[in-house]
């Protein structure tokens, strides 16, 4: 659909879900809520020192499936889980960090809970 | 089509709670938000919150949360908001609003309180 | 929260004329993930509940006359009624629904001579 000017509505329209965010809060989010078309997601990965870090947010529909896809990088340890089966969903999700391994993986299973 | 039907009007005597109900029809009541909207006579609106009947989450406008609860009966596709300690400021129309993004597009009649002794 | 201003508060026009009406928001609604603004036009008839006109700034409803104009971005919107009916005789409120609480402005009385 167009957004400049004459476009009619349309259908089905998806209903909005609220997820919870945390170190990945868009500016429009209020007492760590977010919003989104999409999924809610908990992630899991290593940072520059080695410690972990969990980041949760909304993923818009656009993309996420893949986003959601948890496929292995390269010297990387990071896992991803996304939920859209009610709000704030992602709440309840506890990714672990992957074991290290030294062959790279190509393509992973896509983790929605 | 998709309906919101609401009570015309509400009399209620200050201190007093009130229930007020809106029964959805024509579409699937779990998946659109449904959201309450106060106006009073010659003023804008206000937005009090929304529930989303599937798993009924709310949001509420901290200006009235101390005022207002929102619920819902799935079995008969009803929301309901309650409001407790009504004084004089409470007289309003209050309706209720679907929404499936955060925009509404569709509406109740309203339902007129009054809260007077 | 989000501070909506609607202006002029009345207006007077004949049928036929083209009406323009203004909402100015405190922050920007456009969302810089989809580049869409979060807002939506009312349409409130003596008596009646209030109907939805156009939403996402400039997408119009299924249904609503093609006479309605949305436009505007950031901070700065209009609705305009290229040539104005009887029938459009009305209150006319934006709301926003970037961030909650959803906030609307104080509305525009259209009257008709």
């Known amino acids: 659909k167009k957004e400049d000017g004459e476009s009619t509505a349309p259908t089905p329209r998806p209903k909005i879900l609220r997820c919870k965010c945390h170190h990945h809060c868009p500016e429009d989010s209020v007492n760590n809520i977010c919003s989104t078309d999409g999924y809610c997601f908990t992630m899991i990965e290593e940072d520059d020192s080695g410690m972990p870090v969990v980041t949760s947010g909304c993923l818009g529909l656009e993309g996420s499936d893949f986003q959601c896809r948890d496929t292995p990088i390269p010297h990387q340890r990071r896992s991803i889980e996304c939920c859209t089966e009610r709000n704030e969903c992602n709440k309840d999700l506890h990714p672990t960090l992957p074991p290290l391994k030294n062959r790279d993986f190509v393509d992973g299973p896509i983790h929605h809970k | 089509q998709v309906q919101l039907q609401q009570p015309g009007a509400e009399l209620v005597m200050p201190g007093a709670s009130v229930k007020l109900s809106c029964k959805a029809s024509?579409?699937?009541?779990?998946?659109?938000?449904m959201h309450w909207v106060k106006q009073r006579p010659g003023q804008g609106l206000e937005w009090i919150g929304e529930?989303?009947?599937?798993?009924?989450?709310?949001t509420y406008n901290q200006k009235f949360k101390d005022k207002a609860t929102l619920t819902v009966d799935k079995s008969s596709s009803t929301a309901y908001m309650q409001l407790i300690n009504l004084t004089s400021e409470d007289s309003a129309v209050y309706y209720c609003?679907?929404?499936?993004?955060?925009?509404?597009?569709?509406w109740g009649q309203g339902t007129a309180l009054t809260v007077s002794s | 929260d989000i501070v909506m201003t609607q202006s002029p508060s009345s207006l007077a026009m004949s049928v036929g004329q083209k009406v323009t009406m203004s909402c100015k928001s405190s922050?920007?609604?456009?969302?810089?993930?989809?580049?869409?603004?979060?807002l939506a036009w009312y349409q409130q008839k003596p008596g009646q509940s209030p109907k939805l006109l156009v939403y996402?700034?400039?997408t119009r409803e299924s249904g609503v006359p093609d006479r309605f104009i949305g436009s505007g971005s950031g901070t700065d919107f209009t609705l305009t009624i290229s040539s104005v009916q009887a029938e459009d005789l009305a209150d006319y409120f934006c709301?926003?629904?970037?961030?909650?609480?959803?906030?609307f402005g104080g509305g525009t009385k259209l009257e008709i001579k």
């Open positions: 529930i989303d009947p599937s798993d009924v989450y709310t």
């Open positions: 996402f700034a400039s």
């Open positions: 709301q926003q629904y970037y961030s909650t609480p959803w906030t």
């Open positions: 609003a679907r929404s499936g993004w955060d925009y509404f597009d569709y």
């Open positions: 024509g579409y699937t009541f779990t998946n659109y938000w």
């Open positions: 922050q920007s609604l456009l969302k810089s993930n989809n580049q869409k603004n979060y």
